[in-house]
Interface confidence: medium
């Protein structure tokens, strides 16, 4: 059975502090606690979760933690259940408020001797005690002709006269602490000898050359005075006006007419009421001048048909703000319909080709009027005037394809080949009016050509097969001189395209025939063993029907391909002392020998003192030092062939002979020692 | 005793719905939350969320929202997966997982398991 | 999200053997009321998951007392004192501490 050890207790606790409803509970199985709240289950969250059993409140929310708690077992597994007792808070809490009029309904009807009620708007649980204050000061129970309940929150003035003036407060308190009026109120109870204001002077704005007025009235008893003056503090009146003032008149009821103002005349102007008593009351009004600014520009706008479009219209800068309208064809548009105006903007809906043309924006204020155009353009799709046609270009030579479209805004044109788009480079060019040019033809562009021509409205395309008639060439084209090697077999290959496969056949240039050990295989000049005699030039002929002939001439030089005799070897020298590195080779033309050492061809030219090439070819290198330690590489050339070899060669110390070592050891690494 | 019984194999083509359903017994339905859990075929464990069976409020892990969708019909004590656009990655086994509503003092999440849904996308 | 990472993927031991799995999470898996909620569940072929230790300690009744499970803030393990044939299968490690609620990757006891 589900036993509770500890059970939840309702308790006393206070808005915003920490609370813990307790529940313990002993069972024999696997047991599930959770707590309800009004009969839901209760979320955990980071201000009210389970700990343990119990539940734990970081900060108590007299709104969310109203209502009856309740802890619940259950057993996972019987589904065996137990509620404990329920359990709820008695929350304590004060919240600050303002201090608000409740009679009169508004500020304006406070006259002297009327009864003047205000509120405190602090609440709490339990009902807190209030304290009214005047400018700081606490008020009690029928003072100064007030009636007051210290324990109500109403404060009541009857009546109320002038000495009851001033900014009134409120606290409060209650079990669970202390809190003030988060806004006070200022009565003020005016004296009649006092200049109260009946009509202020408002901020004005004129357009120069016109005349501007400001009103100004105040009551008292007896009446009051009433002054004007200008920003510079010099008084107006009709007997001495200021220079730039001329133009100022002050009537009788206390307006100021200003007439033909200037730019000077702009400013404040402040009308001075004072009575019999009590301070001067100042009331301060602003003479701006019209003006207004340029509009910006508008970029023409490409609209589709069919389409809802808006170009919104910035108004210029201007004082007082410019009111804004668009016109077409010089006729004001409406604020509804097709084609109409809504606030700054002008909307088009459903566009038709018909809407194209220019629409102007008209600013206006008192100081002028500002205009501008927008030049708005219907979109069409394109159509065809040439598509491009399946063509034969010529390769080597220039290729065009034609796409011929009209279309209003222009259409753009792109080309596809293969469906790559075709970007401009040196061999394609696309003109303005959407032909594409090949430059030199080659074989490759013998393919699938399409061009798309595009306006905001959309798209057509056409596609195209080009086939490109192939030149007579040669594929490649034969080396202009051949190296064969004597005594060995050789070929020369030659082969040719063209519109028609061509013939290929070899000729000796002077006109004499192939020797019978040399054959014309389908263009492949095939020697079974070179000899000295088949040295000489050989012409190569590609003939078809339709394109004639072409030739190409070969030099056939005989040579005996380069072998090394002598090749240089692995070699350690002691430092100090002289290297040689052996090198010879033979062949026809007779080689020429070249050596690089580190990565360097040495220039015999520019060897120095150190280092020698014999005629043999072998390379000697005297007094050597670790740096010349590396790989040197022989190289045989003739005009007919180029071969290498290398070795390294490696700088040491000389050993100091140890005792052990007889006069008869040898060194522990070949050596050639000098 | 307690049940959770899921409904039949299901073998569906991409861009099709499906919806499982898991009939619970034994114990008062409002009082557990239910949780559903994916496993993909040679593959682990992974929770997809739950939903409240008190209030109905369903919550879902970032990679299921969207498509999955968890509802109840409470007089039939039923909990409902719904998945939208199926697609060849949600070939799985479902399971329903009967799960508490809190962190409680002596609990455990996941004590009793449907037998899990087969769901096979394929075209 | 808390990832939790079990090792070793596949266990394979003899009969009557100590075996040890071990679960380790990205993150503490302490929850805010002071509770680790870290489960143990046991899943055979074509069956659905079985609960074994809830709590990281805490035996769910029926299951025999050679499963254990120990472990705090990070780590954890599971140990099985001596193997029988019917503990072969699919064990994975869950916490329940931070949503979204995770599963180990599962480790495969199989024999030798």
């Known amino acids: 059975a589900i036993v509770f050890i500890k059970q939840p207790s309702s308790q006393d606790a206070l808005q915003g502090r920490r609370a813990l409803l307790r529940c313990e509970v002993e069972a024999p199985g696997l047991v599930h606690v959770y707590w309800l709240l009004d009969g839901a289950p209760v979320q955990d969250t980071e201000r009210r979760f389970t700990q343990g059993s119990s539940l734990s409140f970081a900060a108590v929310d007299r709104l969310q933690d109203s209502g009856t708690f309740q802890c619940v077992a259950r057993d996972d597994v019987t589904g065996e259940e137990a509620r404990s007792a329920n359990a709820s808070f008695n929350i304590k809490w004060i919240e600050a408020g303002p201090v608000v009029l409740k009679h009169p309904a508004s500020e304006a009807e406070i006259q002297p001797q009327t009864q003047v009620t205000l509120r405190c708007h602090i609440d709490g649980h339990p009902r807190p005690t209030y304290q009214w204050f005047r400018d700081g000061t606490p008020l009690s129970d029928g003072q100064s002709n007030n009636t007051v309940s210290s324990k109500e929150r109403n404060l009541t003035l009857r009546p109320a006269g002038p000495e009851h003036s001033g900014l009134y407060s409120c606290c409060a308190h209650n079990a669970f602490g202390q809190a003030c009026s988060s806004q006070n109120f200022t009565l003020s109870i005016a004296d009649e000898s006092f200049a109260r204001v009946v009509l202020a002077p408002q901020d004005v704005i004129v357009a120069r050359n016109e005349e501007a007025m400001f009103h100004c009235q105040f009551s008292a008893q007896p009446p009051p005075n009433l002054q004007w003056l200008f920003e510079d503090e010099t008084p107006i009146t009709n007997r001495s006006r200021p220079p730039h003032l001329r133009r100022a008149t002050v009537f009788a009821n206390g307006s100021l007419l200003l007439t033909q103002v200037r730019p000077r005349n702009a400013g404040v102007y402040r009308c001075i009421g004072q009575g019999q008593r009590g301070p001067p009351v100042i009331l301060e009004a602003t003479l701006h001048l019209a003006e207004i600014e340029d509009m910006p520009l508008f970029e023409p706008r490409v609209f589709t048909a069919g389409s809802e479009e808006r170009v919104t219209c910035l108004p210029p800068k201007g004082l007082p703000e410019p009111s804004v309208w668009w016109e077409h064809a010089g006729v004001r548009l409406p604020t509804h319909g097709r084609v109409y105006q809504k606030g700054h903007e002008l909307v088009l809906a459903s566009i038709a080709e018909s809407d194209a043309g220019v629409y102007t924006c008209h600013a206006a204020n008192l100081a002028g009027q500002r205009r501008q155009d927008v030049n708005i353009t219907v979109a069409t799709v394109p159509t065809w005037l040439k598509k491009p046609q399946d063509s034969q270009l010529e390769e080597g030579k220039p290729g065009y394809l034609h796409c011929l479209t009209q279309a209003t805004p222009k259409p753009t044109v792109v080309w596809y080949r293969n469906q790559m788009l075709i970007s401009e480079d040196s061999r394609f060019e696309v003109f303005k009016n959407g032909t594409l040019r090949i430059n030199n033809v080659e074989v490759y562009d013998g393919t699938w050509y399409r061009c798309v021509s595009s306006t905001p409205a959309g798209s057509i395309e056409a596609q195209a097969r080009v086939q490109v008639l192939e030149k007579l060439k040669f594929t490649p084209p034969p080396q202009p001189q051949q190296c064969m090697e004597f005594d060995k077999e050789a070929t020369v290959p030659c082969s040719a395209t063209g519109r028609e496969k061509p013939t290929i056949k070899w000729e000796r240039a002077d006109g004499s025939s192939l020797p019978e050990w040399v054959t014309d295989n389908a263009g492949t000049l095939h020697f079974a063993r070179v000899t000295r005699d088949d040295a000489g030039n050989y012409t190569c002929i590609a003939s078809n029907g339709p394109q004639g002939q072409i030739r190409a001439h070969v030099q056939l030089t005989v040579a005996v391909f380069i072998t090394f005799k002598v090749e240089p070897e692995r070699t350690t020298v002691y430092q100090g002392h002289t290297a040689l590195l052996q090198c010879e080779a033979q062949g026809d033309p007779k080689p020429l020998i070249q050596w690089k050492g580190k990565d360097r061809i040495l220039d015999p030219t520019k060897l120095g003192p150190r280092m020698h090439i014999f005629q043999n070819g072998s390379l000697v290198i005297h007094d050597v030092a670790p740096e010349d330690s590396g790989r040197y590489t022989c190289i045989a050339g003739n005009s007919c062939n180029i071969k290498h070899t290398e070795a390294p060669l490696y700088v040491v110390d000389k050993p100091v002979p140890e005792e052990s070592e007889g006069p008869g050891s040898p060194p522990p690494y070949k050596m050639i020692q000098t | 005793q307690i049940q959770l019984v899921q409904s039949g194999p299901e073998l569906k083509k991409p861009g099709e719905t499906v919806k499982i359903s898991c009939k619970a017994s034994g114990y008062t339905f409002t009082t557990y939350g239910m949780s559903w859990v994916k496993q993909a075929p040679g593959k682990g464990l992974k929770w997809m969320g739950w939903i409240n069976t008190h209030s109905g409020v369903p919550t879902y892990v970032d990679e299921f929202k969207g498509r999955s969708a968890f509802s109840l019909e409470t007089s039939a004590s039923t909990a409902y997966l719904q998945i939208n656009n199926l697609k060849n990655e949600d070939t799985a086994t479902y399971f329903c997982?009967?799960?508490?509503?809190?962190?409680?003092?002596?609990?455990?999440?996941?004590?009793?398991w449907g037998q899990g849904t087969l769901v096979t996308v394929s075209s | 999200d808390v990832l939790m990472t079990q090792t070793p993927l596949s266990l394979p031991v003899s009969l009557g053997d100590q075996a040890s799995i071990s679960c380790r999470s990205s993150q503490s898996i302490v929850h805010n009321n002071g509770d680790t909620y870290l489960e143990w569940y046991l899943q055979k072929p074509g069956q659905s998951p079985k609960l074994l230790i809830y709590?990281?300690?805490n035996r769910f009744p029926g299951v025999p007392d050679r499963f254990s499970g120990s472990g705090s803030g990070t780590d954890f393990t599971l140990k099985i004192s001596r193997v029988e044939a019917e503990d072969l299968g699919l064990y994975y490690c869950f916490q329940g501490s931070h949503v979204p609620w995770t599963f180990g990757g599962g480790t495969k006891l199989e024999i030798k």
């Open positions: 997982a009967r799960s508490p509503f809190d962190y409680g003092s002596r609990g455990a999440w996941f004590v009793y």
């Open positions: 709590k990281v300690s």
